[in-house]
């Protein structure tokens, strides 16, 4: 019983370097505690961007120094990644783990390609 995780294929960060996307999972069971991890894949290397464990119906709580924020609604998680720069352009994978009650399930999305364009510096203006 594989758990399916869906996320958009492409997202463009805004001019402030913020990107948002929805991670939706088809829960095979009635999970009450869920862990969501955002992973970045580049050159076959995978690194953790941020992670949060939450109780169904409650808010996601990321660490204070996390670049991620999020909200949950049913089997959907709305994720926002802040402080992105052009060099952070890449594939961001949503991983969902149903931690409790048993059995444990893990689901991995296909990834969202986030494009980040650094804003042009404002030219000096002559007054």
């Amino acid at each position: 019983k594989a758990m399916h995780v869906a996320q958009p294929a492409v997202v463009l960060a805004n001019s402030r370097g913020t990107a948002s996307f929805v991670c939706e999972y088809a829960s095979p069971g009635k999970a009450t505690e869920v862990r969501v991890t955002v992973l970045r894949q580049a050159d076959s290397q995978v690194t953790e961007v941020c992670a949060a464990t939450y109780m169904m119906g409650n808010e996601l709580t990321f660490l204070d120094d996390s670049i991620c924020t999020g909200t949950s609604s049913g089997n959907q998680v709305n994720l926002t990644i802040q402080g992105l720069r052009a060099m952070d352009t890449g594939l961001y994978i949503c991983k969902v783990e149903l931690m409790y009650p048993p059995p444990y399930y893990m689901g991995i999305g296909n990834g969202t390609q986030i494009y980040v364009i650094d804003p042009e510096p404002c030219p000096d203006s002559d007054f």
Epitope: K1, A2, M3, H4, P28, E33, R35, T37, L39, V46, T47, E48, I93, K95, M99, Y100, P102, P103, Y104, Y105, M106, G107, I108
Partner: antibody
Framework: EVQLVQSGAEVKKPGATVKISCKVS????????MHWIRQSPSRGLEWLGF????????YYADSVKGRFTISRDNAKNSLYLQMNSLRAEDTAVYYC???????????WGQGTLVTVSS | EIVMTQSPATLSVSPGERATLSCRAS???????LAWYQQKPGKAPKLLIY???SRATGVPSRFSGSGSGTDFTLTISSLQPEDFATYYC?????????FGQGTKVEIK
């Protein structure tokens, strides 16, 4: 370099208790879920249980539930498996393994042979 | 519990030849949750393939994985002397994690 170094071989009598360990280095231990797996000629590779990154969640195979306990000490970068009420059929090589970000066991310890014999 | 069944139990192949190993799951596991490991005598298993077809870091391109749902295949395109070993498939999408019984690839 990622390394998982396990404690040495153990010989125990049926009914005894043993605790084996797995000391890790080369990665941030507190970010990873860890597993114990055993291997014997009769049972092949058998998953025993896992413990979440923070130790809050533990799952066990039905075959060892109630007898085996997994724990971790993130400050010491160490994972443990305590086995109680040992039986002859628990004789096996025991491996610790790390869960990679995308699911499979990407790094394994060298194995600890536990022999249960009267 | 998802039961993983591998075939054949033993495969006799000459160096340089192609080897095809099969793994069948008792229920769908999804391609993202199927891994292959190589094990040599006295050593721990080593991850070869994850997500059914992605090679782990440092794994030679002669190893390839395919399949989805319940049927998966590991192919070694041209067997090298160091490839003679036992290979295991495993599902990692739900507890309990389960392994196949292994396919031993031996020199013909």
């Amino acid at each position: 370099e990622v390394q998982l170094v396990q404690s040495g071989a153990e010989v125990k009598k049926p009914g005894a208790t043993v605790k084996i360990s797995c000391k890790v280095s080369g990665f941030t231990f507190s970010h990873y879920t860890m597993h114990w797996i055993r291997q014997s000629p009769s049972r092949g590779l058998e998953w025993l249980g896992f413990i979440s990154y923070d130790g809050n969640y533990k799952y066990y195979a039905d075959s060892v539930k109630g007898r085996f306990t997994i724990s971790r000490d993130n400050a010491k970068n160490s994972l443990y498996l305590q086995m109680n009420s040992l039986r002859a059929e628990d004789t096996a090589v025991y491996y610790c393994a790390r869960t990679g970000w995308l699911g499979p066991f990407d790094y394994w310890g060298q194995g600890t042979l536990v022999t249960v014999s009267s | 519990e998802i039961v993983m069944t591998q075939s054949p139990a033993t495969l006799s192949v000459s160096p340089g030849e192609r080897a095809t190993l099969s793994c069948r799951a008792s229920q769908s596991v999804g391609s993202s949750y199927l891994a292959w490991y190589q094990q040599k005598p006295g050593k721990a298993p080593k991850l070869l393939i994850y997500g059914a077809f992605s090679r782990a870091t440092g794994v030679p391109s002669r190893f390839s994985g395919s399949g989805s749902g319940t049927d998966f295949t590991l192919t070694i395109s041209s067997l090298q002397p160091e490839d003679f070993a036992t290979y295991y498939c495993q599902q990692d999408g739900s507890s309990p994690w389960t392994f196949g019984q292994g396919t031993k690839v031996e020199i013909k």
